[in-house]
Amino acid sequence: LIQERRSHQNNPAAHLTGANSSLTGSGGPLLWETQLGLAFLRGLDYHDGALVANKAGYYYIYSKVQLGGVGCPLGLASTITHGLYKRTPRYPEELELLVSQQSPCGRATSNSRVWWDSSFLGGVVHLEVGEEVVVRVLDERLVRLRDGTRSYFGAFMV
Amino acid sequence: LIQERRSHQNNPAAHLTGANSSLTGSGGPLLWETQLGLAFLRGLDYHDGALVANKAGYYYIYSKVQLGGVGCPLGLASTITHGLYKRTPRYPEELELLVSQQSPCGRATSNSRVWWDSSFLGGVVHLEVGEEVVVRVLDERLVRLRDGTRSYFGAFMV
Amino acid sequence: LIQERRSHQNNPAAHLTGANSSLTGSGGPLLWETQLGLAFLRGLDYHDGALVANKAGYYYIYSKVQLGGVGCPLGLASTITHGLYKRTPRYPEELELLVSQQSPCGRATSNSRVWWDSSFLGGVVHLEVGEEVVVRVLDERLVRLRDGTRSYFGAFMV
């Protein structure tokens, strides 16, 4: 039982939450809160929006983003792409891991121009020590942040 | 290997399913089936809609709700909020953990009467012994129950 | 720590990815890539679209499917059902585990006839040795495959 408890206490896990600073508008990945409120890191590191593996293995990684808008203006992307991507020294480009495409703007009704939608991703991927996972949303202008409960990013070793 | 098997058998986990009694209309959280069919509790307790931690640690908690309706009349909620909330003796109010807002009524097309939508939430949170997690949906009238496979609530320690 | 590492290395887990051969049109379950790219099997087997348990216990199973289309043609189902189903020697028919119904066609807007939607399912179920889990989508003609990142199927023991 001591062994079992130790196993859980050491098992890499993290839950990062959305914050006002999450959306940079720079074309980079979303940034996250790592310490305040519900956010934590246990056996994983964080760097510029990325969860960084300290231990090689299979991880269940997940992210949710809250989307919202008013109406469906023509200049706004009709398709939203929300994805988890891996950065590794072995490749020069980010590698797509888990991706969703949605057309949330179609949520607006004749009765209400305000629409809300949510995108959830989760799946098991292999990470080597030092490999990183980031979240990207295109168009990130439609991501709605509030208090860290609606948009988040996490992982745990399986 | 004996140790590994024991570890899994003792790892807290639960999966609760939607039932006819889930929707109370009282403003309280959704209630759940804990024993029949696919539902089970292992190392977690249940009380009035809440999963209760018996062991402190990080848990991946999740919930899915099936939403559905006929048409999109003005009097019906245009925004649905589906959330997981923590109850703890340390605070008088429930604490939002994971929340989604959706505008499912926009799923109905100009011709199509019946619309369906689904909301999934999952993430890692810390629970102390005795702390509780509940599911709330506003407006719960749009939750569609059938056989426990479409609306559910679960957790496991990570 | 040696024990802890061994535990993780032996913990059953899998992530299967969508491929061009996933959609058979035969009325059977979706088929999956098990080795290439992000796909892997560890302590679980695969057979004709099914993840097969080698070890009895509780598993978190999940699937995501990417849906997409152009407009809402009359001949197409207005409701999509995405589900995870169990096959067991103890019953002649598949057992529904986790199911979602969505009306994605309502995503098409006045500005854009192309629509995208995503359905995610995840939950904990018990599997005996030899029991199988498959993914079904009705109408599977709306599933959009690309590179294994948008539609996938996985599991790990909890």
Partner: antibody
């Protein structure tokens, strides 16, 4: 249980306006149900006219839409049908009926009035 | 509009017979189909909703099946009180549309 009762003139002149009211008793019109009008010409089948929700949201059969107005009066717990420019082809038994709930996913017309016969003739 | 084609338009059967009526939709309507019974001079009565679910209080000799475009309504053992016209109705799309009806008579 909920009961419906249609009322209105049984005879309308061609090019005139047909006006019918449906009184809801045993329940509130402000429930999440849709409230419908259906008609049946003599010796023929059923034709859906339209529906209304207590908030005033309506849907009408496109074949009749330009001539039909459906309204609701929550204070009187009733809803009404007006059809203008009527012709002999509008002669029928008119039924009011309760449809499925907006917060539901089946749409059976489960409660019907007894029907009222409207004849269009000069 | 979705066209609902009912057949036969009329039938005659003996008491105790099994009677079946079919309804075909012009496009896929999933299971969004209802069946009604209308007796002479009366309002229609809902018997079956969602293609196969029996409305409360309706005798179990009535049943429905089908999905997509093809649906069947069955009376397992025809009774004298079942003399009526039966209608199918779809609610997948607006406008709601009914089949032309099937008149059931006793031989």
């Amino acid at each position: 249980q909920v009961q419906l009762q249609e009322s209105g003139p049984g005879l309308v002149k061609p090019s005139g306006t047909l006006s019918l009211t449906c009184a809801v008793s045993g329940g509130s019109i402000s429930s999440t149900h849709w409230w419908n009008w259906v008609r049946q010409p003599p010796g023929k089948g059923l034709e859906w006219i339209g529906e209304i929700y207590h908030s005033g949201s309506t849907n009408c059969n496109p074949s009749l839409k330009s001539r039909v107005t459906i309204s609701v009066d929550k204070s009187k717990n009733q809803f009404s049908l007006k059809m203008n420019s009527v012709t002999a082809a509008d002669t029928a038994v008119y039924y009011c009926t309760r449809g499925g709930a907006a917060a539901g996913t089946n749409y059976g017309l489960d409660v019907w009035g007894q029907g009222t016969t409207v004849t269009v003739s000069s | 509009d979705i066209q609902m084609t009912q057949s036969p338009s009329s039938l005659s059967a003996s008491v105790g017979d099994r009677v079946s009526i079919t309804c075909q939709a012009s496009q896929d309507i999933s299971n969004y189909l209802n069946w009604y019974q209308q007796k002479p001079g009366k309002a229609p009565k809902l018997l079956i909703y969602d293609a196969s679910n029996l409305e409360t209080g309706v005798p179990s000799r009535f049943s429905g099946s089908g999905s997509g475009t093809d649906f069947t309504f069955t009376i397992s053992s025809l009774q004298p009180e079942d003399i009526a016209t039966y209608y199918c109705q779809q609610y997948d799309n607006l406008p709601l549309t009914f089949g032309g009806g099937t008149k059931v008579e006793i031989k």
